[in-house]
């Protein structure tokens, strides 16, 4: 499910890192939880992932 991982450690925002999969994108917050957004449809899905799906 993990396609790309972006390191955000030096970012002042509290996200540790985020990742995108075929069906959802998630942010791992340094407060200690994941916050995920699922894709019901192809709308709003990044072009590369639309193609893969």
């Amino acid at each position: 499910d993990q396609w790309s991982t972006q390191d955000l450690y030096n970012n002042p925002v509290t996200a540790v890192f985020n990742y995108q999969g075929l069906w959802r994108s998630c942010v791992r917050e340094s407060s200690g939880f994941t916050e995920c957004r699922g894709y019901f449809t192809l709308l709003g899905l990044p072009a590369m992932l639309q193609a893969v799906r």
Epitope: V27, R28, S30, S31, G32, F33, T34, C36
Partner: antibody
Framework: EVQLQQSGTELVRSGASVKLSCTTS????????LHWVKQRPEQGLEWIGW????????KYAPKFQDKVTMTVDTSSNTACLHLSSLTSDDTAVYYC?????????????????WGQGTSVTVSS | DVVMTQTPLSLPVSLGDQASISCRSS???????????LHWYLQKPGQSPKLLIY???NRFSGVPDRFSGSESGTDFTLKISRVEAEDLGIYFC?????????FGGGTKLEIR
């Protein structure tokens, strides 16, 4: 079905160490953070810290920094809490707790489940 | 640390009554992502805490609709519209917007 199964009751001597375990099932342990929470007899809940099973990163509450070590073995879906230099203040029930949130459109969900707790009694 | 002040400490009710529990945070719980990570748990004797309401007002799966959550700034409220025997126990509010995660001191809901 999401389950967090914790190890059994511990009776330990003052000054000793103890290792508690939390075995998860029903979800991918790498997808969520795993927290440990302490509850002393007849008292409230105290956050100890979290471990991210994806990479082993940990964050501890300052007061537990020198008391605990958290580890995870993703191959066995098991997280552990190691408590050292035990004193009577460490007598408590220790809970593991998995945490995450999300949504699919307007459908919101939470992943927030707790183990049954492990009772630790420190005797002098 | 964010201090979560819960009132009352004890709440005697009759079955069928409405019950209201308050929780005040010492600072804003709005996360940089726009969500407010304020949650309510119920702990019954000899059991682990169970999630009732997450992110202020969302009922967890399987939680009856007599439970509802609301907010006004840094004041948060859990309401039980008609108390049933299975609702008795200790209610905790909790925030995990900020590190460290903190909990309210608990409110014991008991039969009057």
């Amino acid at each position: 079905e999401v389950q967090l199964q914790q190890s059994g009751t511990e009776l330990v001597r003052s000054g000793a160490s103890v290792k508690l375990s939390c075995t998860t099932s029903g979800f991918n342990i790498k997808d969520y953070f795993l927290h440990w929470v302490k509850q002393r007899p007849e008292q409230g809940l105290e956050w100890i810290g979290w471990i991210d099973p994806e990479n082993g990163d940990t964050k501890y509450a300052p007061k537990f920094q020198d008391k605990v070590t958290m580890t995870v073995d993703t191959s066995s879906n098991t997280a552990c809490l190691h408590l050292s230099s035990l004193t009577s203040d460490d007598t408590a029930v220790y809970y593991c707790n998995v945490l995450g949130y999300g949504n699919y459109g307007h459908f919101y969900y939470a992943m927030d489940y707790w183990g049954q707790g492990t009772s630790v009694t420190v005797s002098s | 640390d964010v201090v979560m002040t819960q009132t009352p400490l004890s709440l005697p009710v009759s079955l069928g009554d409405q019950a209201s529990i308050s929780c005040r945070s010492s600072q804003s719980l709005v996360h940089s992502n726009g969500n407010t990570y304020l949650h309510w748990y119920l702990q019954k004797p000899g059991q682990s805490p169970k999630l009732l309401i997450y992110k202020v007002s969302n009922r967890f799966s399987g939680v009856p609709d007599r439970f509802s959550g609301s907010e006004s700034g840094t004041d948060f409220t859990l309401k039980i519209s008609r108390v049933e025997a299975e609702d008795l126990g200790i209610y905790f509010c909790s925030q995990n917007t900020h590190v460290p995660r903190t909990f309210g001191g608990g409110t014991k809901l008991e039969i009057r």
